[in-house]
Structures are given as structure tokens and as C-alpha cells.
Amino acid sequence: MAVTACQGLGFVVSLIGIAGIIAATCMDQWSTQDLYNNPVTAVFNYQGLWRSCVRESSGFTECRGYFTLLGLPAMLQAVRALMIVGIVLGAIGLLVSIFALKCIRIGSMEDSAKANMTLTSGIMFIVSGLCAIAGVSVFANMLVTNFWMSTANMYTGMGGMVQTVQTRYTFGAALFVGWVAGGLTLIGGVMMCIACRGLAPEETNYKAVSYHASGHSVAYKPGGFKASTGFGSNTKNKKIYDGGARTEDEVQSYPSKHDYV
């Protein structure tokens, strides 16, 4: 029950996270005009990954897409790439995790396959979340750098009298959405990986009990991890080093390919 809850919650959290990553990627407010220490402007500028917009006091908003690809800064291209990779991985992860959900029955799919799929989606969510966090952080760093560069020469005097105010940009709402969404996707992925450990059948359908002797004992258990390779079943015996007697009802903590989570 706890495993199903963990898996379900992981899926929901990841779903919200990926929706947030998509929203952040599409949002226009990645950077917004810094209004601090500025004259009260009737023209408000903000920029996204795909277009820049201007909102006027009249209520009119005009957006222009970045129709060039080669003319854009490499950093912006990198951010775009990271966000898209994050979305693609997240979407695939969601697709895989739907079939991996314990509460959904698909034919005669074994628990081992579901465990494998849960782990795969979990890893995908983790990478997706990291991509989003990295993308947003790279953009934020770019903003901070540009902000201080423009602050250094914000007022460039022309003949002493005329001033040119350089537009400075600060963090937009999309950055915060991206950070939160990336974090949620990451958390969801971790939860899926945790759920995977509980999903993996450690035993065959009878309870195997290992007894420990006074010396350093080796207990052989028939039908170890079925989910050890690929999506197929694995009936090879696995050598387990254990100090006490346990049943498959108890939490297992034997070294396995799932233990790095």
C-alpha cells in the first residue's frame, strides 16, 4: 500500500512538475524590465525564450518572435535546449510511468517489469528536473551578469544634458515557475525510484528464510531479483550476504542495481 502511494504521489508530483516546466518554457516573462531606480515608465519590457514583448500604458501589448536562430546568444540556445530536453524526457517518463503504476493492470505484466519501468521513469524525471533547474539557473546567471554590466554604464551622458537610460532586466516569473517545477519533477523522480525498490519482488511465491550460523554465513535464496536485467524475468539464483533471518514481507537492503537511489 505504501509503495502504491509513493508511486502514485511520485507520478502526480512529476506530472505537476512537468506541466510547470512546459508552462515556464512557453512563458514570456523570463526576464522583466527592472523598474527599481528607474523613471516611472509607461512602456514595460519583458522577454521570454521565444519572443520579447512590450506592454504599454495604453493597454496595448506587442510581442515579436526571435526569428533568427544564428543571431541569438549561445546561452539562450543552451537554455532552450535544456528546457526542451527536460520536457521530452519528462513526457517520456510520464508515458512510461503510466504503464508502471501499480494501480493500473495491463495484461499479465509482471511486477518486475513494473519495477523496471518505475525506475526508468524515475530516472527520467530526475534528469528532466535537473535539465529544467540547470536551464533556469543558466538564464538567471546570464541576467545577473547583464544586470551588473548595464548598471556599470546605466547613465551615459551625452553633452552633459541628455541622458540615455539603458533598460535593465531582472528575474521574471518564469524563472521561479521553472525552479519550482524542476524541483517538483526531481522530487517526483526520487519518489518513483524509492517506489521501485518496494515494487521489485525479492522472493518467489513461497517465503524463503535464511538462517545465520556463528561464522560468516552465506545464504542461498532461490529466485532472487527478477527485475535485475531489462524488462524480462530473471530466474538465476543470486548470492545474498545476510546476517539474520528475514522474510520477503520485510524490507530488503541487499546490494542490487537499485541501491544507488
Partner: antibody, heavy 119, light 112 residues
């Protein structure tokens, strides 16, 4: 046809109050940013206040705290409540509309209402 | 506040003449976000409210004759009337519509 009709002007003593109204017709009033502009006896134009669609309000520094701009979209009316009036507030007050695609420029003006502050 | 300086203050012209008036702002009215200048020109005839002629420094308002041309960028702007007609005799004002307060120039009076 777009029409802006101001009313409420008159003669008032210094320190007195007056409320100007501007009735808009021929356009969707709630979709436009509205402003008050005054023309002094010396024929200088002076922007007074602006109220945006999102009800952001901006005032000329010399009228801040004394004048209040407001709008009633249901009645298609713009208001300017003027308190603590001074002699320098004497002017012809125009109600203006900021055009949606005119880069914040005022595309329509009323005929104006005269305000005289004198003892 | 942004100071708008118009010159000359008055201009005596004959019909058919080309007229140029200038407007200088104390701060750039150019917006890098959309590469537009936020300056408007108005015409005020005696006994009438001002009428919008030019917005965005160079775009003619609909219904405005093409003899009126706005130009300039940043801080220096110009209004040109290619061939003055009798009905053009009025006061012309420039206005900053980029920053609050929306300041006007003192005006240029066009007279015969």
C-alpha cells in the same frame, strides 16, 4: 463616433474642491486607458493624471495627494476629484483617451471644462 | 521629469512653403524592447482641443494629410510640413509618452 464630454468645471476659492466628470461614448470605455490633461492660461499643456485599464494610477507630482482620478466602467465615466485647489490649478481641463495602437499617444480629446481658482 | 524643448517658439510662413520644427527631450524616448520612439505630435487650432497628428515619432494618425512627416529618434525629433496650407496654421506640441509624467513641449506657433 468617439465622444468625450467633460463637465463639473467652474469657479472655486483656493482650498476648495471640485469634481470633474468625463462621459465617454462610441467606444468600449473599459478597454482604454484614460487621462486628464490641462491647458494653463499661458497655453501650456500639462498632463495631470492617468488611469490604466488595470487601474494603475499615475499623477503629476504637483497634484499628488490633492487630486484623485477614478473611473466607473459601468457608467462609461472618468472622474477627477480635485481638493485643496490652488491658483496654479486654474486651467482648461481635457479628458483624453490613450489609443490602443498609438504608442501611448492621446488619440481623442474632449472639448474641455474650465476650472478657475480665485478668491 | 523629462524636459521637452521645442524650437522655434513661433514660425511665420507663406502658403506652399516647407516648414520644419524640432523637439528635443532631456532623456531618450527610444525603447530598445521594440525599437520604437515614444513621442507624439499634436496640432491645436484656436478654440479646438489638440488633435493627434503623429505617434511613435513617425507614424501618421489616420486621416492626417501626408504633407505632415515626423522623424527623429532618441532625443531629437522633427515635424515637417512639406507644403503649408492655410488650415495648418496652429500651435504644434510634442509630447513624451515614454515616461511619467507625460510632459509636453511649450509648442511651436505657426502663423502667416
Amino acid at each position: 463616433e468617439v465622444k468625450l464630454v467633460e463637465s463639473g468645471g467652474g469657479l472655486v476659492k483656493p482650498g476648495g474642491s471640485l469634481k470633474l466628470s468625463c462621459a465617454g461614448s462610441g467606444f468600449t470605455f473599459s478597454s482604454y486607458t484614460m487621462s486628464w490633461v490641462r491647458q494653463t492660461p499661458e497655453k501650456r499643456l500639462e498632463w495631470v493624471a492617468t488611469i490604466t485599464i488595470g487601474v494603475n494610477i499615475y499623477y503629476l507630482d504637483s497634484v499628488k495627494g490633492r487630486f484623485t482620478i477614478s473611473r466607473d466602467n459601468a457608467k462609461n465615466t472618468l472622474y477627477l476629484q480635485m481638493n485643496s485647489l490652488r491658483s496654479e490649478d486654474t486651467a482648461l481641463y481635457y479628458c483624453t483617451r490613450l489609443g490602443q495602437t498609438q504608442r501611448n499617444a492621446m488619440d481623442y480629446w474632449g472639448q474641455g471644462t474650465s476650472v478657475t481658482v480665485s478668491s | 521629469d523629462i524636459v521637452m524643448t521645442q524650437s522655434p517658439t513661433s514660425l511665420s510662413v507663406s502658403a506652399g512653403e516647407k516648414v520644419t520644427m524640432t523637439c528635443k527631450s532631456s532623456q531618450s524616448l527610444f525603447n530598445s524592447g521594440n525599437q520604437k520612439n515614444y513621442l507624439a505630435w499634436y496640432q491645436e487650432k484656436p478654440g479646438q482641443p489638440p488633435k493627434l497628428l503623429i505617434y511613435g515619432a513617425s507614424t501618421r494618425e489616420s486621416g492626417v494629410p501626408d504633407r505632415f512627416t515626423g522623424s527623429g529618434s532618441g532625443t531629437d525629433f522633427t515635424l515637417t510640413i512639406s507644403s503649408v496650407q492655410a488650415e495648418d496654421l496652429a500651435v504644434y506640441y510634442c509630447q513624451n509618452v515614454h515616461f511619467y509624467p507625460f510632459t509636453f513641449g511649450a509648442g511651436t506657433k505657426l502663423e502667416l
